[in-house]
């Protein structure tokens, strides 16, 4: 990801920039986002970062915004990298199986499951 | 999703088949599928069921082996219905905006991130 | 089965403050948004705010802003609404309610719990 | 802060009447609304959310409709059980505001 912090970093750093600029974003009253009903979020990206473009398309540049919006490109850029990073390593079934028991576990202890 | 079990049981159950039938799906040693590089599970739901569609199709079926694939079909319809809900409700910039800080919060404490 | 049950009637003095708990079981805590509501006697209803458990984000009326807390403790799978410098208006039934998504509707009410603010 | 007028504020019916209750919003909150029943000294109870859609477990003699702006609840054969106060409630944006209430009596 080419930015000169780390990802982890950069994701608090977009957090407390989210919450600077709050009430300039909230700015427009007629415009409507789509808003994951769940709580799944990984499963969400891309509704998610279509929803800060439409934001993004809406809002007035300038200032530290700019840096939260690219900020927010940036963490996206790092999940299109991860998104790669899920079909490029062809395995033995042993190797896939035991990711699928541990994909498994953790929608068994992690996920947000309705019944 | 039609199935007569709540889906958390139905994981349950599905990690329990899969380690009772390990040995007949990992007979095929010349079968590669692919596996995520990372532990970010949900970003590659696609990628596993396509996997697990390659693992169907080399296996043998007959008896409880059925049921697990059977299952496993089950999950991916709840996840394309957890999916579904993702761009479903279309809602104020407040609400996406609490909605991705929720994201981001989760970034910065749960998911695995490389630097 | 889902469930919120709230702590029992409280009186207080005016200035004081009330702690009113709703303690969730039946489903995972951090699910679901809780959001606190009031009856005053004879009134209809007023959304006093919610609070996410998933990572204990609030908002709130402005109407209730620096006199009312919601907080949680999830390990107990409780919720808390803290209303502060109480005053006689204050006299309500109070009722904490499960969101059924993100900003959804209440799908779940606790059974209410009365606050009597009198000298 | 998005006002919703209900009404009307009260009304009286008969067992088998058929019953309806209007919520008009100061602007547009798409469809984000919901219907609850309040007996006396009992807890609040959603019936309709998303303006039309039934909760589950509630009677089909229940129906909402609308968007936008002016919604409505109708009870198509008033049932003993029925008797209570109608609240709307838009979870559209914050804050979330409730109608001032219906309630519906004995004739």
């Known amino acids: 990801i080419p930015t000169e912090i780390p990802t982890s970093a950069l994701v608090k750093e977009t957090l407390a920039l989210l919450s600077t600029h709050r009430t300039l974003l909230i700015a427009n009253e007629t415009l409507r986002i789509p808003v994951p009903v769940h709580k799944n979020h990984q499963l969400c990206t891309e509704e998610i970062f279509q929803g800060i473009g439409t934001l993004e398309s809406q809002t007035v540049q300038g200032g530290t915004v700019e840096r939260l919006f690219k900020n927010l490109s940036l963490i996206k850029k790092y999940i299109d990298g991860q998104k790669k990073k899920c079909g490029e390593a062809r395995r033995r079934v042993n190797q896939f199986l035991d990711y699928l028991q541990e994909f498994l576990g953790v929608m068994n202890t992690e996920w947000i499951i309705e019944s | 999703i039609p199935t007569e079990i709540p889906t958390s049981a139905l994981v349950k159950e599905t990690l329990a088949l899969l380690s009772t039938h390990r040995t007949l799906l990992i007979a095929n040693e010349t079968l590669r599928i692919p596996v995520p590089v990372h532990k970010n599970h949900q970003l590659c739901t696609e990628e596993i069921f396509q996997g697990i569609g390659t693992l169907e199709s080399q296996t043998v079926q007959g008896g409880t082996v059925e049921r697990l694939f059977k299952n496993l079909s089950l999950i991916k319809k709840y996840i394309d219905g957890q999916k579904k809900k993702c761009g479903e409700a279309r809602r104020r910039v407040n609400q996406f905006l609490d909605y991705l800080q929720e994201f981001l919060g989760v970034m910065n404490t749960e998911w695995i991130i490389e630097s | 089965q889902v469930q919120l049950v709230q702590s029992g009637a409280e009186v207080k003095k005016p200035g004081a403050s009330v702690k009113v708990s709703c303690k969730a079981s039946?489903?995972?805590?951090?699910?679901?948004?809780i959001n606190w509501v009031r009856q005053a006697p004879g009134q209809g209803l007023e959304w006093i705010g919610y609070?996410?458990?998933?990572?204990?984000?609030?908002r709130y009326n402005q109407k209730f802003k620096g006199r009312a807390t919601l907080t949680v403790d999830k390990s107990t799978s409780t919720a808390y609404m803290e209303l502060s410098s109480l005053r006689s208006e204050d006299t309500a039934v109070y009722y904490c309610?499960?969101?059924?998504?993100?900003?959804?509707?209440?799908?779940?009410w606790g059974q209410g719990t009365l606050v009597t603010v009198s000298s | 802060d998005i006002q919703m007028t209900q009404s009307p504020s009260s009304l009286s019916a008969s067992v088998g009447d058929r019953v309806t209750i209007t919520c008009k919003a100061s602007?547009?909150?798409?469809?984000?609304l919901s219907w609850i029943q309040q007996k006396p000294g009992k807890a609040p109870k959603t019936l309709i959310h998303?303006?039309?859609r039934l909760i589950d477990g509630v009677p089909s003699r229940f129906s909402g409709s609308g968007s936008g702006q002016d919604f409505t609840l109708t009870i198509s054969s008033l049932q003993p059980e029925d008797f209570a106060t109608y609240y709307c409630?838009?979870?559209?944006?914050?804050?979330?505001?409730f109608g001032q209430g219906t309630k519906v009596e004995i004739k």
């Open positions: 309610a499960r969101d059924y998504g993100n900003f959804w509707y209440f799908d779940v």
């Open positions: 039946g489903y995972t805590f951090t699910n679901h948004h």
């Open positions: 609070i996410n458990p998933y990572n204990d984000y609030s």
């Open positions: 602007q547009d909150i798409n469809s984000y």
């Open positions: 998303r303006a039309d």
């Open positions: 409630l838009q979870y559209d944006d914050f804050p979330y505001t």
